[in-house]
């Protein structure tokens, strides 16, 4: 695609190339043959993040605490506010417009990856030799107790939800 009639950071209006407004500023009036483009800084709680010809700045995102949100990074005239979720919660979407409680891994499942502000808990089924007997957002699958190392024997086999039960070895009378 060949270059257009106006250069980068310019726009075409009424048969002339006008300068775009820089990030953080909005367009007040287009240039003319005799005047430059007129731009004004965005107000408090507003931003524009690109070279632009917008006549209105965008409002900063509001991190609504009622939705479990808090400010991760305060917005500037050139950047939007970045929201994240309160401890124990995570964003429901990439835009992080609301939060949900981290899920817990049920008994029989352990935490593969602990949740963050932007991702939920990832659970995995406890494989043979491991168990989880609690519903938790932090607990991994635990290995069954090794009866042998305690000089004990297995009295009750373990499952993915229960540990093995060890007992004393039968003594010959």
């Amino acid at each position: 695609e060949p270059p257009t009639a106006c250069r980068e950071k310019q726009y075409l209006i009424n048969s002339q190339c006008c300068s775009l407004c820089q990030p953080g500023q909005k367009l007040v009036s287009d240039c003319t043959e005799f005047t430059e483009t007129e731009c004004l800084p965005c107000g408090e709680s507003e931003f524009l993040d690109t070279w632009n010809r917008e006549t209105h700045c965008h409002q900063h995102k509001y991190c609504d605490p009622n939705l479990g949100l808090r400010v991760q990074q305060k917005g500037t005239s050139e950047t939007d506010t970045i929201c994240t979720c309160e401890e124990g919660w995570h964003c429901t979407s990439e835009a992080c417009e609301s939060c949900v409680l981290h899920r817990s891994c049920s008994p029989g499942f352990g935490v593969k990856q602990i949740a963050t502000g932007v991702s939920d808990t990832i659970c995995e089924p406890c494989p043979v030799g491991f168990f989880s007997n609690v519903s938790s957002a932090f607990e991994k699958c635990h290995p069954w107790t090794s009866c042998e190392t305690k000089d004990l024997v297995v009295q009750q086999a373990g499952t993915n939800k229960t540990d093995v039960v060890c007992g004393p070895q039968d003594r010959l009378r």
Epitope: P3, T4, A5, C6, R7, I13, N14, S15, Q16, D30
Partner: antibody, heavy 116, light 107 residues
Framework: QVQLVQSGAEVKKPGASVKVSCKAS????????IEWVRQAPGQGLEWIGV????????NYNEKFKGRATLTADKSISTAYMELSRLRSDDTAVYFC?????????WGQGTLVTVSS | EIVMTQSPATLSVSPGERATLSCRAS??????LNWYQQKPGQAVRLLIS???RLHSGIPARFSGSGSGTEYTLTISSLQSEDFAVYFC?????????FGQGTKVEIK
């Protein structure tokens, strides 16, 4: 004073190409855009495209994309409009105009007649 | 594309009278509206740019007004040299488009 002087009338056969020139004087050639417009007999004005003579950047009317080619030669302050695959309905007066706020100054026009 | 509609197609006026020409855009063109005069055998002439800015050398009897989609060219007192065809043109959005013209003729 600003002047745009266009090349003379042309008669072309259907399927041929025509190249119209527009020589500018009286201002800095690279400081303003050059617009191209045509007017069919008894009709209104139709925009073809615009070129920035400073570096050759162009915008075309979608209707003429692929058939119109706008160029400029800074060394002789001249802009060109070439139209290919001519049809009888391309018969019109072709104008160049200097940009600014609007089409500030116009050439006298070049009549292109397409006839078999 | 933006469609420009001029009215009336022909305007019959006596010399010395006022002439009012209208131009309507199919969408808001933010005052990027220009007026041109075309006379047979002469180069097209820019009269008014950006709704109301009189081009250099154009007599003050020509004036322009309007906003949004509705624009007007007024010739306060028609002189013999003003009988011509007048075109409006929007410069807000590519492709640039013109009205079909208003012919101002002697009544």
């Amino acid at each position: 004073q600003v002047q745009l002087v266009q090349s003379g009338a042309e008669v072309k056969k259907p399927g041929a190409s025509v190249k119209v020139s527009c020589k500018a004087s009286g201002y800095g050639f690279t400081n303003y855009l050059i617009e191209w417009v045509r007017q069919a007999p008894g009709q209104g004005l139709e925009w073809i495209g615009v070129i920035n003579p400073g570096y050759g950047g162009v915008n075309y009317n979608e209707k003429f994309k692929g058939r119109a080619t706008l160029t400029a030669d800074k060394s002789i302050s001249t802009a060109y409009m070439e139209l290919s695959r001519l049809r009888s309905d391309d018969t019109a007066v072709y104008f160049c105009a200097r940009g600014g706020s609007g089409f500030a100054f116009w050439g006298q026009g070049t009549l292109v007649t397409v006839s078999s | 594309e933006i469609v420009m509609t001029q009215s009336p197609a022909t305007l019959s006026v006596s010399p010395g009278e006022r002439a009012t020409l209208s131009c309507r855009a199919s969408q808001d063109i933010s005052n990027h509206l220009n007026w041109y005069q075309q006379k047979p055998g002469q180069a097209v002439r820019l009269l008014i740019s950006s709704t109301s800015r009189l081009h250099s050398g154009i007599p003050a009897r020509f004036s322009g007004s309007g906003s949004g989609t509705e624009y007007t060219l007024t010739i306060s007192s028609l002189q013999s040299e003003d009988f011509a065809v007048y075109f409006c043109q929007q410069g807000n959005t590519l492709p640039w488009t013109f009205g079909q013209g208003t012919k101002v003729e002697i009544k």
